[in-house]
Amino acid sequence: VIHVTKEVKEVATLSCGHNVSVEELAQTRIYWQKEKKMVLTMMSGDMNIWPEYKNRTIFDITNNLSIVILALRPSDEGTYECVVLKYEKDAFKREHLAEVTLSVKADFPTPSISDFEIPTSNIRRIICSTSGGFPEPHLSWLENGEELNAINTTVSQDPETELYAVSSKLDFNMTTNHSFMCLIKYGHLRVNQTFNWNTTKQEHFPDN
């Protein structure tokens, strides 16, 4: 099994590892499937691409019957199988079978924290946000290891790219020192940013 690892939105080339001459195409059926679902077929020269791969998949017949998937999505991750059937003695027989495992990475960048003063009060508001990752993120605010209550946390998903964005607000009393951590967990991964507030200088120091 061949393993291919790519970043989301990149291009992945999955090779069948087999060549068929133009002359042989009329007597050949090629099936690319992903986890038992069809991606692409070429039957005696007629090509058909399944709806979820249309307009973003190229079949490269000259390059080992490869499929090229453009603008990778997280849901493209999985095991692909290429089957080549050749016509011989009144039937199509399996001439070649190959498996390619595709991993699609979609890491959230380190979140950014911006702060705003709320006029005529001792309350200051900070906003933590990041976008462009997968799977669905879970954001929490921590201070001294204890979880805090955010004002509101919003998680949205782009229906086309399948990537998530997350944003959360936290209000705090600016008359005391604080060190807040914005922690985002997604799948088995995590990313965080720390915001420090120092009352003596009335300034903050985000960790980089």
Partner: antibody, heavy 114, light 108 residues
Framework: QLVQSGAEVKKPGASVKVSCKPS????????MHWVRQAPGQGLEWIGW????????LYDPKFQGKATITADTSTSTAYMELSSLRSEDTAVYYC?????????WGQGTLVTVSS | DIQMTQSPSSLSASVGDRVTITCSVS???????LHWYQQKPGKAPKPLIY???NLASGVPSRFSGSGSGTDYTLTISSLQPEDVATYYC?????????FGQGTKVEIK
Amino acid sequence: QLVQSGAEVKKPGASVKVSCKPSGFNIKDYYMHWVRQAPGQGLEWIGWIDPENGNTLYDPKFQGKATITADTSTSTAYMELSSLRSEDTAVYYCAREGLFFAYWGQGTLVTVSS
Amino acid sequence: DIQMTQSPSSLSASVGDRVTITCSVSSSISSSNLHWYQQKPGKAPKPLIYGTSNLASGVPSRFSGSGSGTDYTLTISSLQPEDVATYYCQQWSSYPLTFGQGTKVEIK
């Protein structure tokens, strides 16, 4: 060349499993297809199975209704129909993959009646 | 899905007549992927012509096929009593595989 199981009469809501056993070849080496024909109607392709690895492909119209399986140890292909309704009354044929369907089973009549 | 439209849906002709059945395909396909079958009542379909114009094994030479792209034709040059049957075209260009609705041929 392809011998199918006998006619079945089933009640609505029941399931039925039709078998197809080739003589002279092993199904492991060929994709096996199923086609149906309702009384007085035309031919409708249901789907295929690659018996070697169990991969299947269905016409979306039959997804959830038909389940195609194969047992390579007995060289037999099966098609199970679930939640039967009167509209499922038809002759069901198995056929072997080729440039075209050169080999067909004799057909199995499935009658759904209360 | 590729739609297959046959015409006529039925016809009646005399023994010795030339009979033509047409099959219109909703999108262009390779001629290698167009096939014709003959089905007699109570029997499984039998291959007649494959790849537009090739006679299947044991098929009499009075049967012929032609066409390309989206338009295909099955011709019986001299209709015989044993040709009474329903004829179907079928595409193997893309899934799901589809058949025409059938043309019933009878003797006058």
